[in-house]
């Protein structure tokens, strides 16, 4: 009997407010054993996949995307699905990120306060892949 | 099909170096961590390096008994593998293997490069 | 680093014997256990990962079981073709680590 798969989540840091110009990591989690993330764009009309996952959690697994330099492009809604076979999880909510304009000079923050400000600590370091997922007939557009 | 053809391997001497290279086709390399693993002969498998993808950095690691010897890189461009081998020592004697990995599992191998080093 | 004890280097078996290889991590690695099978002259080929999870291709005489320390690999009928070296891997954490393999051998 196949299991439930649990639905996936979704964070950014240093956060959802960024600098024009200032990098972005979005990342997605689920259960041991995912194969494959994906990040979806704007009701799934983009994507980017990765099969580079690593070991979150005695009971998760994760995966991220990185934007170097954000573009105002950039800004919209952003959820994750993940393929754990034989089958693709539920999208997670969505994440909005949010560009704005930089303000002053090179001591500006780069985050909102009450934002993550670096990577969550993860107790366990790997990564992750195995057979390319199905489409579900969508176009790999890239996302950055 | 995933193909991975290791390359660069031969005879070198001690505190020598050689750099050996892999040719992956068939799947998406630049979303891939890739690894190598080698087993010397009549031993058991033992893993060397790991680097992941960009999206993670192209982060490295290492084994300890490699650390500040081995350099794992990559060229997403050209879908290719690298590890460069200083200072190599008879005990880095063994069959490399080129490996698309799980997180952290190896999935899918390359036949392996010999590598022997002698005086 | 996470040492992986096998249960022997060598088992002498029969043709149709169900035949059970285990693995003893140090620590808990939270069902991050892989297994494969090697062949003389012949890269390794994943079997299972996740500790249960069979890769395609693989025969389902083939299972695998266990979580925290302790994880087993399994063939309830032991083919010609399954005379080999199996290793177990734990991928909880860096460096991995392979058990040191146990070859199966045809009384």
């Known amino acids: 009997q196949e299991e439930d798969l649990p639905r996936p989540s979704i964070s950014a840091e240093p956060g959802t407010v960024i600098p024009l110009g200032s990098h972005v990591t979005f990342v997605c989690r689920g259960p041991v054993g995912v194969q494959t993330f994906r990040l979806e764009r704007d009701s799934r009309s983009t994507y980017n996949d990765t099969e580079d996952v690593s070991q979150a959690s005695p009971s998760e697994s994760e995966a991220r995307f990185r934007i170097d330099s954000v573009r105002e492009g950039n800004a919209g809604l952003y959820r994750c699905i993940y393929y754990k076979p034989p089958k693709w999880s539920e999208q997670s909510d969505y994440l909005e990120l949010l560009v704005k304009e930089s303000s002053g000079g090179p001591d500006s923050p780069d985050t909102e306060p009450g934002s993550s400000a670096g990577p969550t600590q993860r107790p366990s370091d790997n990564s992750h892949n195995e057979h390319a997922p199905a489409s579900q007939g969508l176009k790999a557009e890239h996302l950055y | 099909e995933v193909q991975l053809v290791e390359s660069g391997g031969g005879l070198v001497q001690p505190k020598g170096s050689l750099k050996l290279s892999c040719a992956a086709s068939?799947?998406?390399?630049?979303?891939?961590?890739m690894y190598w693993v080698r087993q010397a002969p009549g031993k058991g498998l033992e893993w060397v390096a790991r680097?992941?993808?960009?999206?993670?950095?192209?982060?490295?690691y290492y084994a300890d008994s490699v650390k500040d010897r081995f350099t794992i890189s990559r060229d997403d461009s050209q879908s290719m593998l690298y590890l460069q081998m200083n200072n190599l020592k008879t005990e880095d004697t063994a069959r490399y293997y080129c490996?698309?990995?799980?997180?952290?599992?190896?999935?899918?191998w390359g036949q392996g490069t010999l590598v022997t080093v002698s005086a | 680093d996470i040492q992986m004890a096998q249960s022997s280097s060598s088992f002498s078996v029969s043709l149709g014997d169900r035949v059970t290889i285990t693995c003893k991590a140090s620590?808990?690695?939270?069902?991050?256990l892989a297994w494969y099978q090697q062949k003389p002259g012949n890269a390794p080929r994943l079997l299972i990962s996740?500790?249960?999870s069979l890769e395609t291709g693989v025969p389902s005489r083939f299972s695998g079981s266990g979580s925290g320390k302790d994880y087993t690999l399994s063939i309830t009928s032991l083919q010609t073709e399954d005379v080999a070296t199996y290793y177990c891997?734990?991928?909880?954490?860096?460096?991995?680590?392979f058990g040191g393999g146990t070859r199966l051998e045809i009384k």
């Open positions: 490996v698309r990995g799980g997180s952290g599992f190896f999935a899918y």
């Open positions: 068939g799947f998406t390399f630049n979303t891939n961590a």
């Open positions: 680097i992941r993808s960009k999206s993670s950095n192209y982060a490295t």
């Open positions: 620590e808990d690695i939270y069902i991050r």
């Open positions: 996740t500790a249960t």
């Open positions: 891997q734990q991928y909880w954490s860096t460096p991995y680590t």
